[in-house]
């Protein structure tokens, strides 16, 4: 063609995929009528008639644009619909007179990628692998023209580096056109990769400038082998019996090895290897003072057969032993006196404490109590606490009890009861004395008897009101080698209409629960005389 | 084109050692890992052990104390070793080819039965 | 390990239905997730690669989508060639898959 050499470059258009793509024939009214314009396609250099401009008037070419051309700005612009990226080609306007002259439109064609879809080595990368490994893949999938990847490690982008980092990209070409990129990234990894964040950038360009895609950034899983192994004792700090402790086995390796923990045996002195649950956590539930000793751990490679071996760790798991306390049954008689001594062994240092067990009353700090001039009320229990002040919950208590020689000694003297007739009672009387009395009623009916402790008795009994019954009222009396006492238990008749609710409870030490013949069940309620109780 | 094919005995007794050969064509060991799956008959599929296109092993640790995996570049071929076979194990085991991390290619699989 | 749960076990349709198969991870494996066809002395073929792009040579009656933890295979439009079992695996942290759909023609 005449004159080729001195064309200019061609006009430069940039546009999305999917838009319209504007073709301004640039043309001046010198170069050509507008009004008679043949608009071509040049692909391959091969140029293709594609829209006819006559007297103003647009006409397509059959053929691939047919559906997609049209006239605006009064004809001097080809409007062309729903760009692919086929369409990035030159275009051409030719006038026709006074002499024909072209005018070339370079039209770019763009389509941002999808965002990058990184993966990792499902598997990892060990170490030592002999080359570098697939670390990760990035996909970019649907841009226009092919993105550019970048590679960054902990921020900072990843060059190649013979036998350490290589970056293998490839695209393919989908049926509309667009490019699928796949970059992978190969390395060999070291140890220190284990927490470092790996991600993909994809550079593109638009219209509107450059632009880039980050994946979500992602860990690799990283082997290497154990260099170091230790134990870690759960809960630290000081162990005492009844505690649950777990002996743990770690290794700085990963995959971590096989552990095998084992505990030195003082008379062999020969490790014995502990059973460990499937984590290979040895758990002491609950400790004894025999779990303490030397505990060590092996770690193995199975690949490999090459055993670690942990530094020895000392367990000492702190204890009281059983509390004995001298005499273990003491007996005096009113006026006496009388020493206990409480003794105990512990890994640690000990504080002995008594204790009244009735009150919890703190008597004596140390092992020895001392009791002077005993009166009746000293008789009953007494507790020895060995405690190690530095493990809190670390204490084992001995319960002693002092019996007083002495006649029965009653819990009330006299009691009232409401009670309706025929009515079945429930009367209880309580004594105490030692030796241990026994109790008899002054009635028939129904007795039973317990022990409340060695000294003290309960005798229940069920018995029938009757007027008789009524009139007498009830006595019971304890007995024992010493002698006896007696207390006296009044019937009264009570209107079962005027019991309220609140009458139902029991007060005082002895319960009469009354209940009609034909023994359905009614309570009674006894309540104790206003005036104090004679005791003994 | 790409092919893999698994080839190794059809029968094995208990307690045996089954080994299990995976010969690939039109790609290179080298650029391409290569993993063993099974199929127990009537059950799923199952992933026993790989080696990547660096010579790492990887191995399910459900079979790890039993498994060997190993290549031969100049041969194409991936080697499977299995030791102390039961019954249970009894499946068709296939070869499969990493691209690079999922299977794109597989071989058609040989069946083995444990029995005595 | 990451567990993946397949539904239906098993489905039976006419030639030309629309039939899908989900797929459910025990935990997010992102797109890391393939689906695979196998039919009885056959090479097990790959459909479906990171989750939702076709493997060539596959008909585009199979699409996959999903990401995270759920995922479907879909056949627009079933045809008697298609019967088989399909599985899915996830690739995101080791491989495991999932208990498989047998596809049968009614």
């Known amino acids: 063609v005449p004159g080729e050499a001195e064309q200019p470059a061609p006009e430069l258009v940039e546009v999305e995929v999917g838009s319209t793509a504007l073709l301004k024939c640039g043309l001046s009214q010198s170069q050509g009528n507008l009004s008679h314009v043949d608009w071509f396609s040049v692909h391959k250099e091969k140029r293709t008639l594609i829209f006819r401009v006559r007297q103003g008037q647009g006409q397509s070419e059959p053929g691939e644009y047919e559906q997609r051309l049209s006239l605006q700005d009064r004809g001097a612009t080809l409007a062309l619909t729903q760009v692919t990226p086929q369409d990035e080609r030159i275009f051409l306007c030719q006038g026709k007179r006074p002499r024909s002259q072209e005018y070339r439109i370079q039209l770019r064609v763009y389509k941002a990628p999808e965002e990058p879809n990184i993966q990792v080595n499902p598997l990892g990368i060990p170490v030592n692998s002999k080359e570098p490994e697939e670390v990760a893949t990035c996909v970019g999938r649907n841009g226009y023209p092919i993105p550019q990847v970048i590679w960054y490690k902990n921020g900072r982008p990843l060059k190649e580096e013979k036998n350490r980092v290589h970056i293998q990209s490839s695209q393919t070409v989908e049926s509309s056109g667009l490019y699928t990129l796949q970059s992978i990234l190969k390395a060999q990894l070291v140890k220190e990769d284990k927490d470092a964040q790996f991600y993909c950038e994809l550079n593109y360009r638009l219209p509107s400038g450059n632009h880039m895609k980050e994946s979500r950034e992602v860990t690799v899983p990283v082997f290497y082998p154990t260099e170091k192994v230790w134990l870690e004792v759960e809960p630290v700090g000081m162990l005492k019996e009844g505690d649950r402790v777990e002996i743990r086995c770690l290794a700085d390796g990963n995959p971590p090895p096989h552990f095998s923990i084992s505990k030195g045996n003082p008379s062999t002195r020969e490790a014995e290897e502990e059973t460990t649950n499937d984590n290979g956590v040895l758990v002491l539930e609950p400790a004894r003072k025999e779990h303490s000793g030397r505990y060590e751990c092996q770690a193995w490679n199975l690949d490999t057969m090459i055993s670690l071996l942990s530094e020895p760790q000392e367990l000492l798991v702190n204890y009281v032993s059983d509390v004995r306390v001298s005499p273990a049954a003491p007996e005096r008689q009113e006026g006496s006196s009388l020493t206990l001594t409480c003794e105990a062994e512990s890994s640690q240092d000990l504080e002995f404490q008594w204790l009244r067990e009735e009150t919890d009353q703190v008597l004596e700090r140390g092992p020895v109590l001392q009791l002077h001039d005993l009166k009746r009320e000293a008789g009953g229990g007494y507790r020895c606490v060995a405690s190690v002040p530095s493990i809190p919950g670390l204490n084992r208590t001995q319960l002693v009890k002092l019996a007083i020689f002495g006649p029965p000694w009653m819990a009330f003297k006299e009691r009232k009861v409401w009670v309706k007739e025929n009515m079945v009672l429930n009367l209880s009387c309580e004594a105490s004395g030692h030796p241990r009395p026994t109790i008899s009623w002054n009635v028939n009916g129904t007795a039973s008897e317990g022990d409340q402790d060695p000294q003290r008795v309960l005798s229940t009994l069920n018995v029938l009101v009757t007027p008789e019954l009524l009139e007498t009222g009830v006595e019971c009396t304890a007995s024992n080698d010493l002698g006896k006492n007696t207390s006296i238990l009044f019937l009264e008749l009570v209107n079962l209409t005027t019991l309220t609710p609140d009458s139902n409870t029991t007060t005082g030490l002895s319960t009469s629960t009354a209940s009609p013949h034909t023994r359905a069940n009614s309570t009674s309620t006894e309540r104790k005389l206003p005036e104090p109780e004679s005791r003994g | 084109q790409v092919t893999l094919k698994e080839s190794g005995p059809v029968l094995v007794k208990p307690t045996e050692t089954l080994t299990l050969t995976c010969t690939v064509s039109?790609?290179?060991?080298?650029?391409?890992?290569v993993s063993w799956v099974r199929q127990p008959p009537g059950k799923a599929l199952e992933w026993i052990a790989a080696?990547?296109?660096?010579?790492?092993?990887y191995y399910n640790s459900a079979f790890k104390s039993r498994l060997t995996i190993s290549r031969d570049t100049s041969k194409s071929q991936v080697v499977l070793t299995m030791t102390n076979m039961d019954p249970v194990d009894t499946a068709t085991y296939y070869c499969?080819?990493?691209?690079?991390?999922?299977?794109?290619?597989w071989g058609q699989g040989t069946l083995v039965t444990v029995s005595s | 390990d990451i567990q993946m749960t397949q539904s239906p076990s098993s489905l039976s349709a006419s030639v030309g239905d629309r039939v899908t198969i989900t797929c459910k991870g025990s935990?997010?494996?992102?797109?890391?997730l393939a689906w695979f066809q196998l039919k009885p002395g056959k090479v097990p073929k790959l459909l479906i690669y990171?989750?939702?792009s076709l493997q060539t040579g596959i008909p585009s009656r199979f699409s996959g989508s999903g990401s995270g933890t759920d995922f479907t295979l879909t056949i627009s439009s079933l045809q008697p060639e298609d019967v088989a079992t399909y599985y899915c695996?996830?690739?995101?942290?080791?491989?495991?898959f999932g208990g498989g759909t047998k596809v049968e023609i009614k």
């Open positions: 039109g790609f290179s060991l080298t650029s391409n890992g």
């Open positions: 695996q996830q690739y995101y942290s080791g491989y495991t």
């Open positions: 499969a080819r990493h691209r690079p991390f999922y299977f794109d290619y």
């Open positions: 080696i990547s296109s660096g010579g790492s092993t």
């Open positions: 990171d989750a939702n």
């Open positions: 935990q997010n494996i992102y797109k890391s």
